[in-house]
Amino acid sequence: KESCDVQLYIKRQSEHSILAGDPFELECPVKYCANRPHVTWCKLNGTTCVKLEDRQTSWKEEKNISFFILHFEPVLPNDNGSYRCSANFQSNLIESHSTTLYVTDVKSASERPSKDEMASRPWLLYR
């Protein structure tokens, strides 16, 4: 019998470069077997990861994987920083690698990041 853990697929040192003022969706790829786990986002602040309980989140279900999405509408300069998603599974807590947002303030941006850069998804796409 194969093990059936909840799994979080954020790679080591994943990062996104984004513009303040734009909308952005930060995705946590989650794989689970039967019941969808309770997943949350938190933002690293010193030695703690502060839960983002009042932020808009949603699920996107695909064939082999699901995505727990943290919405930024719009991105603010102070959204800069590192985030983790975490899941509660059979009374175990699993936490993803951190994913870092580099926010460029439009006022100080000399040029807009490329389309490729904006669309880049350093987390692992499940195929």
């Epitope: 194969e2 909840v6 799994q7 979080l8 690698h97 692992l124 195929r127």
Partner: antibody, heavy 118, light 106 residues
Framework: QVQLKESGPGLVAPSQSLSITCTVS????????VNWVRQPPGKGLEWLGM???????DYNSALKSRLSINKDNSKSQVFLKMNSLQTDDTARYYC????????????WGQGTSVTVSS | SIVMTQTPKFLLVSAGDRVTITCKAS??????VAWYQQKPGQSPKLLIY???NRYTGVPDRFTGSGYGTDFTFTISTVQAEDLAVYFC????????FGGGTKLEIK
């Protein structure tokens, strides 16, 4: 239950290449990453690289030019290939499964001993 | 790559003693640190992850702590079966291990 088992040649001549297979059971390679770690006799552990669920790879930068990691999901096998072996590549080679969050290695094989000698 | 400096290299202790091993990272690794135990002739076994979380089935005499660059692994009351080499490992980026601490029992 979760198991990983390495199989290799045992003895490799200097300048030749090394191929090791890690056969896993109790979990699917479409769900977990697998790492390769080696340990020279009486020494510490050195991470070589890993293969993610989609087949993409990460390598130890110092060994990247000599390493290749692949897998066959249907056969539940992960393959390590290392080129241009020298005597200091003599070590025990382990495969190890990533935890579900990718932040530690929770199951290890028993390792396969590789000696580089003429 | 991140260097994990582990001290001491050797520990000779009596059963019942308290043991502390430290690991210092060359840059901040958040809490992305694991500790492993390798008994003679065996493969490594995961003891601690997220710097302080005990892995399933690991006795509570094993504890870990730390954040950023400084990490500590403690065995509160050493037992004879704890004879092993202990390794720290960072997983913040390309994984690296400490050099190991060989624990010997008097």
């Amino acid at each position: 239950q979760v198991q990983l088992k390495e199989s290799g040649p045992g003895l490799v001549a200097p300048s030749q290449s090394l191929s090791i297979t890690c056969t896993v059971s109790g979990f699917s390679l479409t769900g977990y990453g697998v790492n390769w770690v080696r340990q020279p006799p009486g020494k510490g552990l050195e991470w070589l690289g890993m293969i993610w669920i989609d087949g993409s790879t990460d390598y130890n930068s110092a060994l990247k030019s000599r390493l290749s990691i692949n897998k066959d999901n249907s056969k539940s096998q992960v393959f390590l290939k290392m080129n241009s072996l020298q005597t200091d590549d003599t070590a025990r080679y382990y495969c190890a499964r990533d935890r579900p969050d990718g932040r530690a290695m929770d199951y290890w094989g028993q390792g396969t001993s590789v000696t580089v000698s003429s | 790559s991140i260097v994990m400096t582990q001290t001491p290299k050797f520990l000779l202790v009596s059963a019942g003693d308290r043991v502390t091993i430290t690991c210092k990272a060359s840059q901040s690794v958040s809490n992305d640190v694991a500790w492993y135990q390798q008994k003679p002739g065996q493969s490594p076994k995961l003891l601690i992850y997220y710097a302080s979380n005990r892995y399933t089935g690991v006795p509570d005499r094993f504890t870990g702590s730390g954040y950023g660059t400084d990490f500590t692994f403690t065995i509160s009351t050493v037992q004879a079966e704890d004879l092993a080499v202990y390794f720290c490992q960072q997983d913040y980026n390309s994984p690296t291990f400490g050099g190991g601490t060989k624990l010997e029992i008097k």
